[in-house]
């Protein structure tokens, strides 16, 4: 014999107090699947948590974090403090990246600069706390008399023909 509750769609619950009639979820609750005997209470995004998506009868609210914080954990269950670019969050708070490392985001850890020489390249732009190094052509390509590097074409403004 089929369970009459299996006919209750998402957004409703099977109301035992009313002969297993499918009743709509009450305000501030939801059921995301059919056949539910209760509706779940909607998550409330309070304090550091901001509402990213409102609760509906069929889906829970979704939260994110207020500026200065970023989400951690499943479903943004926590908000972790941001640091500045060029820093990482340690047990003692935000600390500057050590020399030779960088962080170009407000979260996460400082990562070592790229070692250009591993790819046989030279450093074109030095790294900083906030930015990785930029690797350029290989040192051999830069040696005098090397013909393999094509010099860049002179820059022209659009609409002007070369003199």
């Amino acid at each position: 014999l089929q369970d009459p509750c299996s006919n209750c769609p998402a957004g409703t619950f099977c109301d035992n107090n009313r002969n297993q009639i499918c009743s709509p979820c009450p305000p501030n609750s939801f059921s995301s699947a059919g056949g539910q005997r209760t509706c779940d209470i909607c998550r409330q995004c309070k304090g550091v948590f901001r509402t990213r998506k409102e609760c509906s009868s069929t889906s829970n609210a979704e939260c994110d974090c207020t500026p200065g914080f970023h989400c951690l954990g499943a479903g943004c269950s926590m908000c972790e403090q941001d640091c500045k670019q060029g820093q990482e969050l340690t047990k003692k708070g935000c600390k500057d990246c050590c020399f030779g490392t960088f962080n170009d985001q407000k979260r996460g850890i400082c990562r070592p600069w790229t070692n250009c020489s591993l790819d046989g390249k030279s450093v074109l732009v030095n790294g900083t706390k906030e930015r990785d190094v930029v690797c350029g052509p290989s040192p051999a390509d830069l040696s005098p008399g090397a013909s393999s590097v094509t010099p860049p074409a002179p820059a022209r403004e659009p609409g002007h023909s070369p003199q």
Partner: nanobody, 124 residues
Framework: QVQLVESGGGLVQPGGSLRLSCSAS????????MSWVRQAPGKGLEWVSD????????FYEDSVKGRFTISRDNAKNTLYLQMNSLKPEDTAVYYC?????????????????WGQGTLVTVSS
């Protein structure tokens, strides 16, 4: 071991003020966000306020905004809740609670340590 001890509760008339304190020990207080949570007679737990580890970010339940102020003194390992313009509906046991991860604000379900609470009664 972690200990949180609240004080400062009592009987106050409507419109009056109280300052709650929470003395913390057993962990690096300055690295953790802290909260105040309350439980009115016969009701469930209600989040009241959060403060981040450094004290520069504070958050409040709508019903207490503009009346309550959370603060902390990291040198004294103490959390405070200044409560002004108190109403009968503020009557509750007030708990301080510690958040589980350094420099992180969690939801109430995830707080890992709670004090024993201090009773605030607002009545004429």
């Amino acid at each position: 071991q972690v200990q949180l001890v609240e004080s400062g509760g009592g009987l106050v008339q409507p419109g009056g003020s109280l300052r709650l304190s929470c003395s913390a020990s057993g962990f690096t207080f300055s690295s953790y966000a802290m909260s105040w949570v309350r439980q009115a007679p016969g009701k469930g737990l209600e989040w009241v306020s959060d403060i981040n580890s450094g004290g520069e970010s504070t958050f409040y339940e709508d019903s207490v905004k503009g009346r309550f102020t959370i603060s902390r003194d990291n040198a004294k390992n103490t959390l405070y809740l200044q409560m002004n313009s108190l109403k009968p509906e503020d009557t509750a046991v007030y708990y301080c609670a510690k958040h589980p991860l350094t420099f992180t604000i969690a939801t109430m379900n995830d707080y890992d340590y709670w004090g024993q609470g201090t009773l605030v009664t607002v009545s004429s």
